[in-house]
Structure formats: structure tokens, C-alpha cells
């Protein structure tokens, strides 16, 4: 069975959009009107992994770019990065664990938990124009809830 993917954009629960900030970083900020075209379109691939209740394992690539969000240790801290891959080999059903996120979808709100680092989530800051990062707390100051907007292929 080939990998199933969908194209989407993500906004945090404060309606901040995600845009590229340099070649290997995403940031979150409020966009309006034509500026909305700056937001990153993800190719969300449904990959094999541990399933439980509303957890679905996914990989988050940047559409038509050979970049995937991945989770690695940097200075002993789980860190979110954009990693370059060989486009001939990705996406694939059996993604390396650093690329896998458990998508938790409840009442149209999404969280993305790192499969590599349980209880660490894709997060944004309350402040504008700050990097998207991997956060180890839920329900605190940082934002871990997102909404997804489908984009036609």
C-alpha cells in the first residue's frame, strides 16, 4: 500500500500561520490577505507507527521541498528542525522515528507529539514572529494546539 498524503496548512490556536524563516526554520506569525500566500504548505504523510485512540502517526514534509520536520537531541534537549532528505526515497511508509509525530485530533484541534520524544510537542510562542519549536509542556504559556486547513493538490 503506497503512502497516503494530504496537503494542508497549520495555524496555532491563536490563528498564527507558519512561514519559512531562513532555509531550515519555521516561525509563527499573524498573516492577513495576500500575505497568507507566504504560509508553508505541508505534505502530511500517514506512516506506520504505534496507534492508540486518537493518535495517528504522521510525517510532516514541506510540499514540493525535500524538507521534513524532525526531532533530534541538541545539547541534550529535544529539538525541532527541518531536515533535508533525498526526494527519491521520501516519503516512505517506514519513516525514521525522528520524522514521526503522533497526530492527536480532538474536536478539530490537533497536537503533534514527537514519536522520538514522548510528551514533547510541536509548539509556538505567544509572541509574534518566533520560531516553531519542540516544547516539553502542554497547557502552559506555549501553544501546542493547531488547526488544519486542507489544500487541494
Amino acid at each position: 500500500a503506497p503512502v497516503r498524503s494530504l496537503n494542508c496548512t497549520l495555524r496555532d490556536s491563536q490563528q498564527k500561520s507558519l512561514v519559512m524563516s531562513g532555509p531550515y526554520e519555521l516561525k509563527a506569525l499573524h498573516l492577513q490577505g495576500q500575505d497568507m500566500e507566504q504560509q508553508v504548505v505541508f505534505s502530511m504523510s500517514f506512516v506506520q507507527g504505534e496507534e492508540s485512540n486518537d493518535k495517528i502517526p504522521v510525517a510532516l514534509g514541506l510540499k514540493e521541498k525535500n524538507l521534513y520536520l524532525s526531532c533530534v537531541l541538541k545539547d541534550d534537549k529535544p529539538t525541532l528542525q527541518l531536515e533535508s532528505v533525498d526526494p527519491k526515497n521520501y516519503p516512505k511508509k517506514k519513516m525514521e522515528k525522528r520524522f514521526v509525530f503522533n497526530k492527536i485530533e480532538i474536536n478539530n484541534k490537533l497536537e503533534f507529539e514527537s514519536a522520538q520524544f514522548p510528551n514533547w510537542y510541536i509548539s509556538t510562542s505567544q509572541a509574534e514572529n518566533m520560531p516553531v519549536f519542540l516544547g516539553g509542556t502542554k497547557g502552559g504559556q506555549d501553544i501546542t494546539d493547531f488547526t488544519m486547513q486542507f489544500v487541494s493538490s
Epitope: A1, L6, K93, K103
Partner: antibody
Framework: QVTLKESGPALLKPTQTLTLTCTFS??????????VSWIRQPSGKALEWLAH???????RYNPSLKSRLTISKDTSSNQVFLKITNVDTVDTATYYC??????????WGQGTLVSVSA | DIQMTQSHSSMSTSVGDRVRITCRAS??????VAWFQQKPGQAPKLLIY???TRHSGVPSRFSGSGSGTDFTLTISNVQPEDFADYYC????????FGAGTKLELK
């Protein structure tokens, strides 16, 4: 937690149409990536995958049975249905529904036994 | 379609033994293989996916190996509750199952 339960007629006659219902809880078929399959098992025999439906209403069928199968869903009622037309005695089996985002079926219903007899 | 062949329809073993249940795919399925345990009157239970990844809650005595066409489910230190039917399944193309191997008490 995730639960699935199959229901349908216990007994049918050959040539009739079998309609099965899978009622589930603990997850939603509106969740992107989610899917439910139907699988059957004649008594004492192997498992046979029949059909799968995804959250986006994409459907997959076992090629050898495709002409007789229709899978559908009612997302708001948390139900998946399977219709098998023109049943015969070889369709006598326990029918299971199983949840899978992929095809390694992590959650199964208890099964419902369907007998086809003249 | 891809056939999954379990060469032994039944195998006999004793409590505490190690047993290997094998399965062969009719064509290369990479590691797209799952193993299930089924007890009489019950639904199958997922043990292994990706050929070698244990499903959550599955005891560590169950392990899977293989890739391509040849796959093995190993139960080390067989326990009384392990006597059951075991099925392999591929999901490289539309899912197909092996005919099953009944693990019996010697």
C-alpha cells in the same frame, strides 16, 4: 478506549444481500488518517480482508470480491457498513471490523457470525 | 495478489521452550508484515508490525524478524497462555493473511 462491535443478520439464504454494521467508539472517522476494515474468517479457516474505508471516503476492496462489496460510513453515528450481494454458503463466516490508520489492524471487534444456508 | 505461506499448520512445544513460527511471502514485501495471535472464540490480537516492532502491551518474549520474503515470529520461554493460533499478514499491497499455525502443547 477504542471499541468496535459488529452486528448483522445471523442467517441468510443464498442470493440474498448481507448488510453488516460496525459501531465504534474511542475514535472518530473524521480524524484524518483514520480507517476501518472488514475482515472475515470461516470457521476453522484463515482470515480474509474484504474492504477498507478511510476518513476521506476513499475505499479499497479485495479484488477477488470487489464486484459484490460496498463499504460505506456514517461519520456522525460512528458507524461503518459493509454490503455483500448475492451471498452463497461459502460466505458463512465470522465477520470482524478492525480499525487501522495503516493496514496492521491494532483494534478489532468481537466478530459476528453469519450463516448462509438454503 | 501476494500469498503468505505458513509452512506448518501446527507446531508442538512445551512451556518454557523457544518456538519459531515461519511465514513466506510470494514476493518481496519489504518489512510490511504483521503477526496476530488468536484464541478460540476471540478476535485476533496484534502482536508485531513492521516485521519486528512489538505492539504496545505485548510481552517481550514475542519477537519478529525478517524482511523481503521470509519472516519469523519467535516466542521465547513459551507460557501456557501462548497456546493459540498465529497468523502472519502482509500489507505491502492489499492485505493478505497466512493460513495460520496452531501452537499446541507437546
Amino acid at each position: 478506549q477504542v471499541t468496535l462491535k459488529e452486528s448483522g443478520p445471523a442467517l441468510l439464504k443464498p442470493t440474498q444481500t448481507l448488510t453488516l454494521t460496525c459501531t465504534f467508539s474511542g475514535f472518530s472517522l473524521s480524524t484524518s488518517g483514520m480507517g476501518v476494515s472488514w475482515i472475515r474468517q470461516p470457521s476453522g479457516k484463515a482470515l480474509e480482508w474484504l474492504a477498507h474505508i478511510y476518513w476521506d471516503d476513499d475505499k479499497r476492496y479485495n479484488p477477488s470480491l470487489k464486484s459484490r462489496l460496498t463499504i460505506s460510513k456514517d461519520t456522525s453515528s460512528n458507524q461503518v457498513f459493509l454490503k455483500i450481494t448475492n451471498v452463497d454458503t461459502v460466505d458463512t463466516a465470522t465477520y470482524y471490523c478492525a480499525r487501522s490508520a495503516y493496514y496492521s489492524f491494532a483494534y478489532w471487534g468481537q466478530g459476528t457470525l453469519v450463516s448462509v444456508s438454503a | 495478489d501476494i500469498q503468505m505461506t505458513q509452512s506448518h499448520s501446527s507446531m508442538s512445544t512445551s512451556v518454557g521452550d523457544r518456538v519459531r513460527i515461519t511465514c513466506r511471502a510470494s514476493q518481496d514485501v519489504d518489512t510490511d508484515v504483521a503477526w496476530f495471535q488468536q484464541k478460540p472464540g476471540q478476535a485476533p490480537k496484534l502482536l508485531i508490525y513492521w516485521a519486528s516492532t512489538r505492539h504496545s502491551g505485548v510481552p517481550s518474549r514475542f519477537s519478529g524478524s525478517g524482511s523481503g520474503t521470509d519472516f519469523t515470529l519467535t516466542i521465547s520461554n513459551v507460557q501456557p497462555e501462548d497456546f493459540a493460533d498465529y497468523y502472519c499478514q502482509q500489507y505491502s499491497s492489499y492485505p493478505t493473511f497466512g493460513a495460520g499455525t496452531k501452537l499446541e502443547l507437546k
